[in-house]
């Protein structure tokens, strides 16, 4: 089967790579620009330059492009807890990232938030806090995992799945509170 | 298909509290991301809360912190907003909407409800 393209992908694809193919004139391939810049003028014929400009600040491109506009620098989310990794240049995007013992949660395929990696209190470091994705841990005799916290035996309720990590201590237990813990 | 269904929605005096729920249908629900969106008349939309698919994580909006709840029963496939101390400011349509995991296009949510009014005046 073949692949389904766009108006521009099947326009370019008659141009060898790095040339598009003009829009007024689909006999002439004109140089596409380069990364940082943006496509001021096509070119006048074959063989003759491409008029490309470079981009303004607080705009950037990051590939070899004809595009007619530059991309506007994305700002990091104060509000989800980002910081800047590294400042927008012509030819790359703003870096955005989480500060020290945070990690990303990514609440959309565009969009995270920053949160503190689990300290494993009451548990150890089963596996450790990564860029995206919260320490595993595991937890100590008597404490069961809830929400990626190690929680006493004592908070266990018969209906919850901690029960069976739980089960000697809620046998021993008959309802007394502070049974829970080893 | 996909349906996000909102309701709760009303006439509050100031000080006063709501809840709104969302009833989805069509999709997974345990296995997505939620969240809450108003529109204030005139304005533009303001992401109000997000929940995550376990219901473990949250985001609130700086002006809803503290007085706003967000919450999701999966067993009955329902987001829920319990909303408090409700203020003039808080007047808009509120959107229940999924948020995008995959080929989102730079979209943040790929699909919302009606939408449900709610007024807070005396």
């Known amino acids: 089967l073949v692949p389904h393209l766009g108006d521009r992908e099947k326009r370019d694809s008659v141009c060898p790579q790095g040339k598009y193919i003009h829009p007024q004139n689909n006999s002439i391939c004109c140089t596409k620009c380069h990364k940082g810049t943006y496509l001021y003028n096509d070119c006048p014929g074959p063989g003759q330059d491409t008029d490309c400009r470079e981009c303004e600040s607080g705009s950037f491109t990051a590939s070899e492009n004809h595009l007619r506009h530059c991309l506007s620098c994305s700002k990091c989310r104060k509000e989800m807890g980002q910081v800047e990794i590294s400042s927008c240049t012509v030819d790359r995007d703003t870096v955005c990232g989480c500060r020290k013992n945070q990690y990303r949660h990514y609440w959309s395929e565009n969009l995270f938030q920053c949160f503190n990696c689990s300290l494993c209190l009451n548990g150890t470091v089963h596996l450790s806090c990564q860029e995206k994705q919260n320490t595993v841990c595991t937890c100590h005799a008597g404490f069961f995992l809830r929400e990626n916290e190690c929680v006493s035996c004592s908070n266990c309720k018969k209906s919850l799945e901690c029960t069976k990590l739980c089960l000697p201590q809620i046998e021993n237990v008959k309802g007394t509170e502070d049974s829970g813990t080893t | 298909e996909v349906q996000l269904l909102e309701s709760g929605g009303g006439l509050v005096q100031p000080g006063g509290s709501l809840r709104l729920s969302c009833a989805a249908s069509?999709?997974?629900?345990?296995?997505?991301?939620m969240g809450w969106v108003r529109q204030a008349p005139g304005k533009g939309l303001e992401w109000v809360s997000f929940i995550d698919m376990y219901g473990a994580k949250t985001y609130y909006a700086d002006s809803v912190k503290g007085r706003f709840t967000i919450s999701r029963d999966n067993s009955k496939n329902t987001l829920y907003l319990q909303m408090n101390s409700l203020r003039a400011e808080d007047t808009a349509v509120y959107y229940c909407a999924k948020l995008c995991l995959m080929d989102c296009s730079g979209d943040i949510f790929d699909y919302w409800g009606q939408g449900t009014l709610v007024t807070v005046s005396s």
């Open positions: 069509g999709f997974t629900f345990v296995a997505y991301n």
